[in-house]
Amino acid sequence: GDMLIEKTIKREVVLEEGTTAFKNWVKTGTTVYRQFWIFDVQNPDDVAKNSSKIKVKQRGPYTYRVRYLAKENITQDPEDHTVSFVQPNGAIFEPSLSVGTEDDNFTVLNLAVAAAPHIYQNSFVQVVLNSLIKKSKSSMFQTRSLKELLWGYKDPFLSLVPYPISTTVGVFYPYNDTVDGVYKVFNGKDNISKVAIIESYKGKRNLSYWPSYCDMINGTDAASFPPFVEKSRTLRFFSSDICRSIYAVFGSEIDLKGIPVYRFVLPANAFASPLQNPDNHCFCTEKVISNNCTSYGVLDIGKCKEGKPVYISLPHFLHASPDVSEPIEGLHPNEDEHRTYLDVEPITGFTLQFAKRLQVNILVKPARKIEALKNLKRPYIVPILWLNETGTIGDEKAEMFKTQVTGKIK
């Protein structure tokens, strides 16, 4: 019996036309939601004038349906047993699952003003930019609607820049009508232990963002893993959102709608400083903001964002060093609410439930040539928003899964 089940599993998890895995892989049967909480700044003038602590108040959730589009340009390569595809991006606002509308306004860091002196460290350029910032009446903070902040708005300061640059700014701009990829993954036909593992991303086996092994694209995209998952296994996956590969370790056994699953969690040491976890040394790419690589819990992904000072962390700076969160008031990190986990069915390796939580932050530094920033006495890693992307197998699918997989094994 066991041999037969193993044979069936091996056949059905292969990523090719006609298998159970392939059908779900092309277009997920799970409804995926992305909830946003925006950090509304309560004391913008005080911060800009006196370099005070930034007082934030989270507002949310504002919920969007995501990952509802099928993979496109799916091409099998029988030579190397891979399948390539792109994942289209789309987001649909869900008013019934939100605390307000997309037109709700927030006071947040002025993304363009904060980024300008970071991208252009040359004094002459900064003096030129300063005159445009003043002319556009821009300042350190701005009021923007949810829709503008997430998906893009025409920035008044950038619109005055006299050379060709993108004048539209948004945390996720551009998103709708864009694609992630090309991904090329092993289909598992020749070796089931490699199924769904990424062979290349955007035509490359490395990211070109990090030095050494930190630059490697490891594992799958976290939607599934090679079958017969053991608790002792470290699940490696690549997340384009955070521009790096990361890993999850076994946390606990869970019953999900009658299906036994393993909950894998992102451990704190994945966000540790090289001092605590030497393996992370190549994720520390600058020495000043990181206090000579002793700070932890934030990841500078600027290289992956055209040089913009974007830092990724866990929500509310969970697992981050005190120096990171000290200049910010109003954060309340909580392991249950703010950690990321994957609930993986161990026989098939399918992720049947997940919660991906991350926070987007922008670094703002004192800039003597930019009047809006020249009163700052220290750098701040400013939280802009955090998100919770979740998906759970539907009741119907769960029943089907039980009869076809777990039921047969029992």
Epitope: S123, V125, R368
Partner: antibody
Framework: EVQLQQSGPELVKPGASVKISCETS????????MHWVKQSHGKSLEWIGG????????KYNQKFKGKATLTVDKSSSTAYMELRSLTSEDSAVYYC???????????WGQGTLVTVSA | ETTVTQSPASLSMAIGEKVTIRCITS??????MNWYQQKPGEPPKLLIS???TLRPGVPSRFSSSGYGTDFIFTIENMLSEDVADYYC?????????FGAGTKLELK
């Protein structure tokens, strides 16, 4: 070592134009602003304008708008300044000077003497 | 445009004496003042940059102070090699503007 090498002296007739060059070495040309400064005989210094080679952004002193045009050739790491409709008032030594991030005019060329005479 | 008024226009000092040059700006420029030395037949040389920062390799007898609109450049013990023209430059806003210069001679 950063070096700025300017073209030689020019004797030009009134109404004509002249193009001065400033060849740089020893640094990443595109990352630093190149400025041009005028010094009339026995007089002070006047900032003409600056160009940021990375994106070609230029800024001129209003006084020299229409008189000077700043350009760069990234392939040869050379900055140029063209002066047009020359009069005796334009007779001066012209310097190119380069920034170092937050330091203005950290490096200077040796100067180019332009003499406007009939 | 920020105008920079430099004084005195010329100065005759003996070796070992303290030299003081002043620049006053028409607008508040924080501490965005720079000081240059120019010897005959040579381009200017940066001595002190914004924030009263002495440039590497410049002797410590040179210093500057000031904030806002009033700035002082000092040579603590003048040496014969300090004979030159000295210029201040405001770099707070464009156009960048220089002072008219101070000619420092030996008494």
């Amino acid at each position: 070592e950063v070096q700025l090498q300017q073209s030689g002296p020019e004797l030009v007739k009134p109404g004509a134009s002249v193009k001065i060059s400033c060849e740089t070495s020893g640094h990443t040309f595109t990352e630093y602003t190149m400025h041009w400064v005028k010094q009339s005989h026995g007089k002070s210094l006047e900032w003409i304008g600056g160009i940021y080679p990375n994106n070609g952004a230029t800024k001129y002193n209003q006084k020299f708008k229409g008189k000077a045009t700043l350009t760069v050739d990234k392939s040869s790491s050379t900055a140029y300044m063209e002066l047009r409709s020359l009069t005796s008032e334009d007779s001066a030594v012209y310097y190119c000077a380069r920034d170092r991030y937050d330091v203005w005019f950290a490096y200077w060329g040796q100067g180019t003497l332009v003499t406007v005479s009939a | 445009e920020t105008t920079v008024t430099q004084s005195p226009a010329s100065l005759s000092m003996a070796i070992g004496e303290k030299v003081t040059i002043r620049c006053i700006t028409s607008t508040d420029i924080d501490d965005d003042m720079n000081w240059y030395q120019q010897k005959p037949g040579e381009p200017p040389k940066l001595l002190i940059s914004e924030g009263n920062t002495l440039r590497p390799g410049v002797p410590s007898r040179f210093s500057s102070s000031g904030y806002g609109t009033d700035f002082i450049f000092t040579i603590e013990n003048m040496l014969s090699e300090d004979v030159a023209d000295y210029y201040c430059l405001q770099s707070d806003n464009l156009p960048l503007t220089f002072g008219a210069g101070t000619k420092l001679e030996l008494k």
